[in-house]
């Protein structure tokens, strides 16, 4: 397995642990969601990654100005996404790069599922069922 | 002891079986146990479900219903070492869409 596909809870550096919550979010399109990470903030800065599918490699999250916001209050880092869309579906990871070792550690990830009908075809299918 | 990442969620239709893997790099004598945390309920301790089924520590839940929803976490322990815990997989139980009232074969319709 690739190194990013495995993790452990080492007894090593203080930045080797990042706790992420929640594990899963399902919300309707247009809602606001928040995900959180708790870590030793003195060890290094936190960034956010995103991947659409389980088997993909996470990429650096491009924060959409005015809609996505990252904040940090000491040990607690928060990613807020407003007006969620279907293209926001995926798994979000917080990541910390250790100041002293340059090692990188990730949280477990938060899966976001945006609910609702994404295509006209899905909407038609639902109406057919109702009929 | 390494724990490999597991899917963040698993969607299973009502009445089907749910299979959870606990991938790790431990030797054969590792002790794998399964626990469930109710989603949004952070009470401790989580519900103990039992040991894993095979060398991979698989958990199988048969005939899934709505009450099975939650986060399923496995713990792996080697000897007296402290356990390692998986990130957990959220089980989503899907209600199959209702069959339309007039869902009948063409032959039936033409009778």
């Amino acid at each position: 397995a690739r190194s990013e596909d495995r993790y452990r809870n080492p007894k090593g550096s203080a930045c080797s642990r990042i706790w992420q919550s929640p594990r899963f979010i399902a919300r309707k399109r247009g809602f606001t969601v928040k995900m959180h990470c708790y870590m030793n903030s003195a060890s290094g800065n936190v960034s956010w990654l995103w991947k659409q599918e389980m088997d993909e490699n996470p990429q650096q999250l491009k924060l959409e100005k005015g809609r996505m916001e990252e904040s940090q209050n000491e040990s607690l880092a928060t990613l807020t996404i407003q007006g969620i869309r279907f293209e926001d579906n995926g798994i979000y990871f917080c990541q910390q790069k250790c100041n002293n070792t340059s090692e990188v550690y990730q949280g477990c990830g938060t899966e976001l599922r945006v609910m609702g009908f994404s295509t006209l075809a899905q909407l038609k299918q639902r109406n057919t069922l109702k009929d | 002891l390494w724990m490999h990442k597991v899917p963040a969620s698993l969607m299973v239709s009502l009445g089907e079986d749910a299979h959870f893997q606990c991938p790790h790099n431990s030797s054969n004598n590792a002790n794998v146990t399964w626990w469930r945390v109710l989603h949004g309920n952070y009470t401790w301790p989580p519900e103990f479900l039992g040991p894993g089924e095979d060398p991979n520590g698989t958990l199988i839940i048969q005939n899934v219903n709505k009450s099975h929803g939650g986060i399923y976490v496995c713990r792996v322990q080697e000897g007296n070492e402290s356990y390692q815990q998986s990130c957990g997989t959220y089980l989503r139980v899907r209600q199959p869409p209702p069959r339309p009232f007039l869902d009948m074969g063409e032959g039936t319709k033409n009778r």
């Epitope: 706790w19 959180h36 708790y38 000491e74 040990s75 607690l76 | 309920n41 401790w44 301790p45």
Partner: nanobody, 116 residues
Amino acid sequence: DVQLQESGGGLVQPGGSLSLSCAASISSSSIWVRAWHRQAPGKQRELVAAINNDGQTMYADSVKGRFTISRDNAKTTVSLQMNSLKPEDTAVYYCNVVTPKGHQYWGQGTQVTVSS
């Protein structure tokens, strides 16, 4: 509003022990992380130890093997057992609680002084 009440601080000689306790006026099912931070004079506040709802712990490198964090869910308390104390452990120690929704609460702080 959530209240956090710390206790157990004081003056102790190097090599001695102290136990800090923090009681939270919030149900344990509403807590994701409980932690202790500290702030020494002229320095930034830093994480000392934390424990989450899964029972996992994290410690600052400087206290590993000397400090132990624990919790009592029935009483919604979090404790910090500090052994082999050093003069550099002198600081104001703050209790910190975080809810699953990301709300963060802080205690008023309790002074720990390690001096001969």
